[in-house]
Interface confidence: low
């Protein structure tokens, strides 16, 4: 079983899923309002968003004193955060600016991918090897959407029997999408295009917030019980609390290289020939060159106009 990395508003913590009764290790302490968290295992980096400081920060997990600011302007409520470990990019949602943005892992070359028809975007999950991204929106018209990680092919995949979709996670091995609904109190799963929807845990969960997966097991944080719970991902069997008495459990991830499988990086050679951003794409050649917001891509599809 994995280590679970979770945000706890005042800190980020790691807890062993098999021994959750023991104290969690504080990875980064003294935080204001840590909400979302993710990591790039191969680089030894942990990222988090702080909704009070309106910032995204990072640390090297072997050097906990080395906190760096990544994005510090133009954020209001960065509720969701996801690292593209393959293309080495950072994606985030902001439920107040109503945007989904992308940047390099250091925060440079920032680009707004989506800014329309977003109300309360929250969880975001990436599948870099297929070039797709997924996010939940718990606004007036709640839904789960999918799009290319380059901003293409946006599509609503779930928009029925959905109210407060909070947690979202992908099963890369079995090509499934799992999500938790805090109002309808369930965890459901579907194919990655939203078809073949099935209940995993029927409406019995008090207030599930964030969701992750490792091998056969789903793990999630619950605001009502102040705990991390788990169950079998196929059957929902064995539902149990594995770590309790958490101050304010927020985002959660299974902290393991297994959750960030290696694959061919289409941007790996010479940044795909792109002058600036090279983003994963679901269509051949499986990458798309892009420019920071406000800068035009020239007709060659590779180079951004001078002044970027």
């Amino acid at each position: 079983a994995p280590l679970l990395l979770y945000a706890n508003r005042r800190d980020l913590r790691l807890v062993d899923a098999t021994n959750g009764k023991e104290n969690a290790t504080i990875v980064v302490g003294g935080l204001e309002d840590a909400a979302a968290v993710d990591f790039v295992f191969s680089h030894g980096l942990i990222y988090w968003s702080d909704v009070s400081e309106e910032a995204i920060k990072r640390t090297e997990f072997n050097k906990t004193e080395s906190v760096q600011n990544v994005v510090v302007s133009g954020l209001l409520s960065p509720d969701g955060l996801a690292c593209d470990w393959l293309g080495e990019k950072l994606y985030w949602t902001d439920s107040e600016t109503n945007r989904i943005e992308v940047s390099n892992l250091d925060g440079s070359l920032r680009k707004v991918l989506f800014w329309q028809e977003l109300d309360q975007p929250r969880a975001i999950a990436l599948d870099p090897s297929s070039g797709f991204m997924y996010w939940t929106d718990w606004g007036e018209v709640p839904k789960i959407e999918r799009a290319g990680m380059d901003g293409s092919s946006r599509f609503i995949i779930i928009n029925s029997e959905i109210y407060w979709p909070n947690g979202l996670t992908l099963d890369y091995e079995e090509q499934k999408l799992y999500w938790a609904d805090a109002k309808l109190n369930f965890i459901h799963k579907s194919n990655l295009d939203g078809t073949n929807r099935q209940a995993v845990v029927k409406g019995s969960l008090p207030h599930p917030f964030a969701l992750t997966l490792f091998e056969d097991i789903l793990y999630w944080t619950d605001w009502s019980t102040h705990s991390i719970l788990a169950c079998n991902k196929y059957t929902g069997e064995g539902l149990r609390e594995i770590h309790s008495d958490i101050f304010s459990p927020m985002d959660i991830h299974a902290f393991s290289q297994q959750r960030q499988p290696n694959a061919t990086n289409p941007c790996g050679i010479d940044n795909g020939g792109c002058s600036h951003l090279c983003l994963m794409s679901p269509v051949k050649p499986f990458y798309q060159c892009a420019c920071p917001t406000g800068v035009k891509l020239l007709e060659n599809g590779k180079t951004c106009k001078d002044g970027a």
Epitope: A1, T18, N19, G20, K21, E174, D216, I217, A230, C231, N232, Y234, E237, G238, R240, E241, I242
Partner: antibody, heavy 121, light 112 residues
Framework: EIQLQQSGPELVKPGASVKVSCKAS????????MYWVKQSHGKSLEWIGY????????NYNQKFKGKATLTVDKSSSTAYMHLNSLTSEDSAVYYC??????????????WGQGTTLTVSS | DIVMSQSPSSLAVSVGEKVTMSCKSS????????????LAWYQQKPGQSPKVLIY???TRESGVPDRFTGSGSGTDFTLTISSVKAEDLAVYYC?????????FGGGTKLEI
Amino acid sequence: EIQLQQSGPELVKPGASVKVSCKASGYAFTSYNMYWVKQSHGKSLEWIGYIDPYNGGTNYNQKFKGKATLTVDKSSSTAYMHLNSLTSEDSAVYYCARGGMGLRRDYFDFWGQGTTLTVSS
Amino acid sequence: DIVMSQSPSSLAVSVGEKVTMSCKSSQSLLYSSNQKNYLAWYQQKPGQSPKVLIYWASTRESGVPDRFTGSGSGTDFTLTISSVKAEDLAVYYCQQYYSYPYTFGGGTKLEI
């Protein structure tokens, strides 16, 4: 080191009852199901049932319903199996075995040393 | 209940020989959602508790020598010992954990 330490051999009379214990150490007791298995002399293995120490939930083989009762004491990380109305058919070695994390159907990765029960007048 | 049948019930071999034993289930143990076979193999040496060798039909438990190999899918499974050692004297059981009640095969007794 993960260990399952079972209580010693029992010699009891027909009609009596017995309680076999299995003390777990070296892992988070409430995170894993505890299974019980019967092995009659020179015979194969039979699954009796399991208990989920986290919530006390049980699942019995229909054949052993009414014969076996499974309980746990979380404070001492000990699982118990109570066998009642004993007959010579109940004479066997009984094993406790650790299963999966209560979250999945699973094989048994650690076994107790076995408790020999002899029912004889 | 799923019935597990093992064959042969016993076999005698010499040290260094290759051994195969069979286990058949009365219904498929392959779970379509994860393409895993819910079958385990155990070794029980005289006077000892069973010890798991193989799970998911073919995954070797850590610490188990690589001369032990599990194979098969669906209803037909095989345990192979590539080169038998004297310490392999034991009874070998297969077990399904696909559905309750979990059931074991009758065992194959390996004599050296």
